[in-house]
Interface confidence: low
């Protein structure tokens, strides 16, 4: 007889693949000539390219009024006219519902001033945003980031009781957290008291770009934080190659997508958008490179090959890469839900295996590292129920010239510098 | 191709001001920031900051805040530079730079590639 | 800030001979943005290698660039005449962007 399978979990919209932050709508939308719409309309017209990139949700500013450091003139139910008005909002909305892209509102108060929670007047400002939740969920956005919990005092009383309106508004509804902190014991105090919260932290940022660290990093976060759900990234809003050297960027990409948890990325991460190659561009948000006319005040500074349409174009592109992870990450259930092991492979490699009762598993082996490494797949780390095969199947690789599809010997495997390597495998009985 | 063509030489007293323009051709002007650097005689490079044209947003290092401004017209591509309470020792050639954009390997980056010939300031009673 | 000192302060040298040019940082700079200049008399200086070891278009590959942390190298691996002349290393990986002092490189 056949084993019973195993209960499917209950599934959030946010568990099911990744989210996209648009920190800043004016850059995401471009300079380039002919965007003279409204930056919220202009996003619009962009949500057949997010649906392309299979994303669930996208996080959305502040976009509200906010005259810096001025808490009288920061007002959280209104949309700043450079953004666009409430009937582009509510506009964009509709359109986002209608291709399965949930909208999430970031409500951080004060972003364009010096404390973003205007440290004096903490009472005042959580009654703003207590007013603006209940406004903004009868207005049908899907959820709410703030960000710079740590200036918050008090946060998690003030956390738990805006999750409260959230969650009592519909389960369905989601608050992300944000902070600059990369400790774990600070990411704990918070998560402690807020069963549901989606935290967004600095704690990878740190790995140190090695493989053992960065294995001991998750490991240690998944094994605090028990079985609850989490959120992959490596800040709460930058791009990620503010931390990552460009030759680590499909690394990370696929460890974000693979690991147990909602990936969380930026606007621009899945190009490698870097505000280093275009002068004159703010660090936290440079402008979205759609095509070579994106930074028209730069004749040939960019090129075909760093923008969304080079890139589209180019099978190897790390666009193409993100596509095709984001494809595997919200249809495989191995990926989707599946119980998580890592297990030793050899200094400068971390490595894990992703599997769900009888479905196809995953197996995935990165390394960090400069020079090219054998694997040691050490399966005897593995508990019975995620055995490794002596074979599996070559999804894809970071690295272009490995054949996909083809079956590789798990006792013999070489990994090239900054190379990735997804593999498939089947349950065996 | 890009061309900074920097005004010329100039003699002047203690106490006074010099203003040095640098007029940009073959490229964008507001598109990338213009970096000023001086260099005393017989010595090294000094970076003194940057303006970009786009904005008007100015960066002076500590040293010379409070007594450089750096402005630009756009209508004729030129960027200037000016220090006032000149001193002696700020005798100097003052150059204007602009950097390029190298991208490859994935990688950027953003060193100053194009010079101005330079403008010698002779500060002397 | 962060202070490069470059070392020897002058270099004699013959054509055809390899020459070696230190520049130490007081703390470590990304190599990503390190850059070597060349400065000749009455010239402005012209940029020979960014990003530590990558030449500028037109350079020459006698030019080398290594080093990475706070140790910095360029190597001209066969001098020719037009060589003679200051060299300069040059962070601008963080703020205020900062120079060595310069090494000349004189004919014996």
């Known amino acids: 007889r056949a084993p019973r399978c195993r209960e499917l979990p209950a599934q959030k919209w946010w568990h099911t693949g990744a989210l996209y932050r648009i920190g800043d709508l004016q850059a995401f939308q471009g300079h380039g000539a002919g965007n003279l719409a409204a930056p919220i309309s202009g996003l619009k017209g962009r949500l057949d390219y997010l649906s392309s990139l299979k994303v669930k949700g996208l996080v959305l500013g502040p976009i509200h009024k906010n005259q810096k450091d001025d808490v009288a003139q920061t007002d959280l139910l209104q949309i700043d006219p450079n953004f666009g008005s409430k009937e582009d909002f509510d506009s964009l909305l509709q359109s986002a519902k209608k291709k399965s892209i949930r909208v999430i509102l970031d409500l951080t108060p004060n972003y364009r001033g010096e404390n973003s929670w205007f440290s004096t007047q903490v009472d005042t400002v959580a009654t703003k945003v207590k007013d603006a939740l209940e406004f903004w969920l009868q207005a049908g956005v899907d959820g709410f980031q703030v960000r710079d919990i740590e200036n918050l005092k008090d946060a998690s009383s003030f956390l738990a009781e805006w999750q409260n309106i959230t969650k009592g508004f519909s389960e369905d509804r989601l608050l992300i957290a944000g902070t600059n902190s990369s400790d774990l014991q600070q990411i704990l105090s918070l998560l402690e008291s807020n069963k549901d919260l989606l935290l967004t932290s600095s704690y990878l940022s740190d790995s140190g770009s090695t493989g053992e660290h960065t294995k001991s990093l998750v490991t240690q976060y998944l094994n605090a934080t028990g079985n609850r759900w989490c959120s992959w990234s490596l800040s709460q809003a930058r791009l990620l190659t503010s931390f990552l050297p460009a030759q680590l960027l499909r690394l990370y990409q696929l460890m974000l997508f693979t690991l147990p948890g909602t990936p969380v990325f930026s606007y621009g991460d899945e190009i490698g958008l870097d505000a280093a190659a275009l002068p004159g561009q703010p660090m936290e948000a440079p402008v979205m490179l759609w095509d070579e006319s994106s930074f028209p005040d730069i004749p040939g500074a960019v090129s075909a090959n760093m923008t969304v349409k080079g890139q589209s174009e180019d099978p190897g592109s790390l666009l193409s890469l993100f596509r095709r992870l984001s494809d595997q990450r919200s249809k495989e259930r191995s990926l989707l839900h599946g119980d998580f092991h890592a297990f030793s492979a050899g200094p400068g490699l971390f490595s894990y295996i992703r599997h769900w009762d009888q479905n196809e598993r995953f197996l995935v082996v990165l390394n960090f590292g400069d020079v090219g490494l054998s694997a040691g797949l050490q399966a005897s780390d593995l508990p019975a129920s995620a055995s490794l095969p002596a074979k599996a199947d070559l999804l894809l690789s970071t690295q272009p010239g490995r054949e996909e599809g083809s079956p590789l010997e798990l006792e013999r495997l070489k990994l090239e510098p900054h190379e990735g390597l997804l593999l498939r495998f089947p349950y065996a009985a | 191709q890009v061309q900074l063509v920097q005004s010329g030489a100039e003699v002047k007293k203690p106490g006074a001001s010099v203003k040095v323009s640098c007029k940009a051709s073959?490229?964008?002007?507001?598109?990338?920031?213009m970096h000023w650097l001086r260099q005393a005689p017989g010595q090294g490079l000094e970076w003194m900051g940057w303006?970009?044209?786009?904005?008007?947003?100015?960066n002076y290092i500590q040293k010379f805040q409070g007594r450089v401004t750096m402005t630009r017209d756009t209508s004729i591509s030129t960027a200037y530079m000016e220090l006032s309470r000149l001193r002696s020792d700020d005798t100097a050639v003052f150059y204007c730079?602009?950097?390029?954009?190298?991208?490859?390997?994935?990688?950027?980056?953003?060193?100053?590639?194009?010079w101005g010939q330079g403008t010698l300031v002779t500060v002397s009673s | 800030e962060i202070v490069l000192t470059q070392s020897p302060g002058t270099l004699s040298l013959s054509p055809g001979e390899r020459a070696t040019l230190s520049c130490r940082a007081s703390?470590?700079?990304?190599?990503?943005?390190l850059a070597w200049y060349q400065q000749k008399p009455g010239q402005a200086p012209r940029l020979l290698i960014y990003?530590?070891?990558s030449r500028a278009t037109g350079i020459p590959d006698r030019f080398s660039g290594s080093g990475s942390g706070t140790d910095f190298t360029l190597t001209i691996s066969r001098l020719e005449p037009e060589d003679f002349a200051v060299y300069y290393c040059?962070?601008?990986?963080?703020?205020?962007?900062?120079f060595g002092q310069g090494t000349k490189v004189e004919i014996k």
């Open positions: 073959g490229y964008t002007f507001t598109g990338y920031y």
């Open positions: 730079a602009r950097i390029r954009v190298y991208y490859e390997s994935g990688i950027y980056n953003y060193p100053l590639h194009h």
């Open positions: 040059q962070q601008y990986g963080s703020s205020p962007w900062t």
């Open positions: 703390q470590s700079v990304s190599s990503s943005y």
């Open positions: 990003g530590a070891s």
């Open positions: 303006i970009n044209p786009n904005t008007g947003d100015t």
